[in-house]
Interface confidence: low
């Protein structure tokens, strides 16, 4: 799953590691626009 931040939120893309605080990282788990987020994020939640 690639990073999904809105155009308003492009510069937090360096916060990469998913948290253990959520069960899964679904597409609805982050805001929608992927075009301004260069860093892909892991889909794994331990």
């Amino acid at each position: 799953v690639s990073s999904a931040l809105t155009p308003h939120l492009p510069t937090h893309a360096d916060s990469q590691t998913p948290s253990t605080g959520t069960d899964t990282q679904t597409p609805s788990g982050s805001a929608a626009n992927t075009t301004l987020s260069p860093t892909p994020r892991s889909n794994d939640i331990s």
Epitope: L5, T6, S15, Q16, S19, S28, G29, S30, S37, R41
Partner: antibody, heavy 119, light 108 residues
Framework: AVQLLESGGGLIQPGGSLRLSCAAS????????MSWVRQAPGKGLEWVSA????????FYADSVRGRFTISRDNSKNTLYLQMNSLRVEDTAVYYC????????????WGQGTLVTVSS | EIVLTQSPGTLSLSPGERATLSCRAS???????LAWYQQKPGQAPRLLIY???SRATGIPDRFSGSGSGTDFTLTISRLEPEDFAVYHC?????????FGGGTKVEIK
């Protein structure tokens, strides 16, 4: 276990300055964006500011922009909020919160530190 | 700025009853970017739901979230004594991140 411990709150006069700190442990601090969220007595939550994992990018609510500065020291696993030109309406409990993968929602919160701005 | 309005302000119910809390946004929230938190007196908020309907780790399945666009709902299917608290919704579709005013669920 993830722990976030805020400090630095207290009583301050209007126009004064205060620096809040949040000591983080139990996770790779530099990998996560962090935020400050505040709650005035008896009121709802208000997002104040956010900072990216590297510290290179910051966001602010309009109500504090130009007066507050968020920063972090990843070598010390500590988040800061420098508050200048404090106003009575800044009185609140200030929470440090760990973000999930970006400036989105918060999976861990500290217990908060009370800032009271009064003459 | 997206304004979130929660209703009712206070919900008076008995243990075992169903609680339905509403969060309405002033404009559509992209990708259902909405979270719900529980807060008890003197404590920090606790994440319950993200992405409008996904439960956070350790959250009992009596808590469920639904909705999209501008209307979102948190449902507690059967209230337990520990569920009486204030519930906040938060949108993260755009900055500034905003919260609703909260709904207090109190014992009737």
């Amino acid at each position: 276990a993830v722990q976030l411990l805020e400090s630095g709150g207290g009583l301050i006069q209007p126009g004064g300055s205060l620096r809040l700190s949040c000591a983080a442990s139990g996770f790779t601090f530099s990998s996560y964006a962090m935020s400050w969220v505040r709650q005035a007595p008896g009121k709802g939550l208000e997002w104040v500011s956010a900072i990216s994992g590297s510290g290179g990018s910051t966001f602010y609510a309009d109500s504090v922009r130009g007066r507050f500065t968020i920063s972090r020291d990843n070598s010390k696993n500590t988040l800061y909020l420098q508050m200048n030109s404090l106003r009575v309406e800044d009185t609140a409990v200030y929470y440090c919160a760990k973000e999930v993968m970006g400036p989105i929602f918060f999976d861990y919160w500290g217990q908060g530190t009370l800032v009271t701005v009064s003459s | 700025e997206i304004v979130l309005t929660q209703s009712p302000g206070t919900l008076s119910l008995s243990p075992g009853e169903r609680a339905t809390l509403s969060c309405r946004a002033s404009q559509s929230i992209i990708s259902s970017a909405l979270a719900w938190y529980q807060q008890k007196p003197g404590q920090a908020p606790r994440l319950l739901i993200y992405g409008a309907s996904s439960r956070a780790t350790g959250i009992p399945d009596r808590f469920s979230g639904s909705g999209s666009g501008t209307d979102f709902t948190l449902t507690i299917s059967r209230l337990e004594p520990e569920d009486f608290a204030v519930y906040h919704c938060q949108q993260y579709g755009s900055t500034p991140l905003t919260f609703g005013g909260g709904t207090k669920v109190e014992i009737k």
